[in-house]
């Protein structure tokens, strides 16, 4: 079952999940100047049985210079920030071999990806919060949050994380030293 | 909790237009994508067309371009459905959608009578 | 365009009972397929995503099955709050096309 709504925001922190239970969603979204195909899935789907699971659907994204797209959209106040290299990315997936049944591993990039993975999150997911670079995590409890299902509603548990001051960013689970990923995580498995 | 909030009930007239709008509350606007979809009795369910507040993008149903036009704000977190032209056949209740058609909001009636 | 056609336009049905709604596509559609059910002057309610995956707060005797062409909609014990009309969508390529709609009547 979907959760109606996204992970909690916690100022100057990133969340990620180790792994995503089947029924999640990822949206196909394409970095500016691309758009997704017009046939084909609007996302990706974590699917399969409690043996196997993995991602249905492929994204794809198509220039969309050649066509007369008119800005309709009030612009954003900042553009969005160039992506993280493949390399990177390769680095923090390495760190997530997991092998939970009924989950799948973060999927891999597509090309010209937008620069933040955007998901639809079902029951019973966990992500973990991380501070971002130049901010020490404060924790009073686990850093990190889970959609649970209460009385036909579906809602995320509170991350007991407070980031402030200056220090390395902290770590997700079964990830190795900072110095794997020095700039913190890459930003198609962030979400601010 | 999410929300699409829909603007009331239109009364116009023939040839002329109307501007309908949908208010998102309760997720991240600019992440996904917000649907129009066209109801009348007896025709069911059609899809008009949908639009990304984070980015440029829109695509129309072939039958819809040139009389709807869809746009958003993104600092008032609303999309807009502009129908030209109007002739009675425009007559319907109109849906927004958002979050991959999970959420709906409650209708916008159109009635085009001179 | 991919044409949905939900064959039947009404389904006779009583408490307890259980009954299929199914939905052909014209072109193969993978699992991208929702259902939809809508009650009279309310906007239609998610119930399906993916072909069978629940939306939340949606009960477990609702199942959806089906990939391709041919896709159902299963409501195991029906309840008489479920007397409604159905539809399903496809939204695998643009643009996004509905069923025309099927409705539980009750016997």
């Known amino acids: 079952e979907l959760c109606d709504d996204d992970p909690p925001k916690i100022t100057h922190a990133t969340f990620k999940a180790v792994a995503y239970k089947e029924g999640t969603m990822l949206n196909c979204e394409c970095k500016r100047g691309f758009r997704r195909i017009k046939s084909g899935s609007p996302y990706m789907l974590c699917t399969g049985n409690s043996s196997h699971s993995s991602w249905d659907n492929q994204c794809q994204c198509t220039s969309s210079a050649a066509r007369n797209t008119t800005k309709q959209v009030t612009p954003q106040p900042e553009e969005q920030k160039e992506r993280k290299t493949t390399e990177m990315q390769s680095q923090m997936q390495l760190a997530d071999q997991v092998s939970l049944p009924g989950h799948c591993r973060e999927p891999p990039p597509w090309e010209n990806e937008a620069t933040e993975r955007i998901y639809h999150f079902v029951v019973g997911q966990t992500v973990y919060y991380q501070c971002v670079q130049g901010y020490r995590a404060l924790h009073r409890g686990p850093a990190e949050s889970v959609c649970k299902m209460t009385h036909g509603k579906t809602r995320w548990t509170q991350p007991q994380l407070i980031c402030t001051g200056e220090t390395e960013p902290s770590q997700f689970p079964g990830e190795e030293e900072p110095q794997a990923s020095p700039d913190g995580l890459p930003e198609s498995e962030t979400s601010r | 909790q999410v929300q699409l909030q829909q603007s009331g009930a239109e009364l116009v007239r023939p040839g002329t237009s109307v501007k309908m709008s949908c208010k998102a509350a309760?997720?991240?606007?600019?992440?996904?994508?917000i649907g129009w979809i066209k109801q009348r009795p007896g025709h069911g369910l059609e899809w008009i067309g949908d639009i990304h507040p984070g980015g440029d993008y829109t695509n129309y149903n072939e039958k819809f371009k040139g009389k709807a036009t869809l746009t958003a704000d993104t600092f008032s977190s609303t999309a807009y459905m502009q129908l030209s032209s109007l002739t009675s056949e425009d007559s319907a209740i109109y849906y927004c959608t958002g979050r991959n058609f999970a959420y709906w909001g409650q209708g916008t009636l159109v009635t085009v009578s001179s | 365009d991919n044409v949905l056609t939900q064959s039947q336009k009404f389904m006779s049905t009583s408490v307890g009972d259980r009954v299929s709604v199914t939905c052909k596509a014209s072109q193969n559609v993978g699992t991208n397929v929702a259902w939809y059910q809508q009650k009279p002057g309310q906007s239609p309610k998610a119930l399906i995503y993916?072909?069978?995956y629940r939306y939340s707060g949606v009960p477990d005797r609702f199942t959806g099955s089906g990939s391709g062409t041919d896709f159902t909609l299963t409501i195991s014990n029906v309840q008489s709050e479920d007397l409604a009309e159905y539809f399903c969508q496809q939204y695998n390529s643009y643009p996004y096309t509905f069923g025309g709609g099927t409705k539980l009547e009750m016997k």
């Open positions: 993916s072909a069978s």
């Open positions: 309760g997720y991240t606007f600019t992440n996904y994508w």
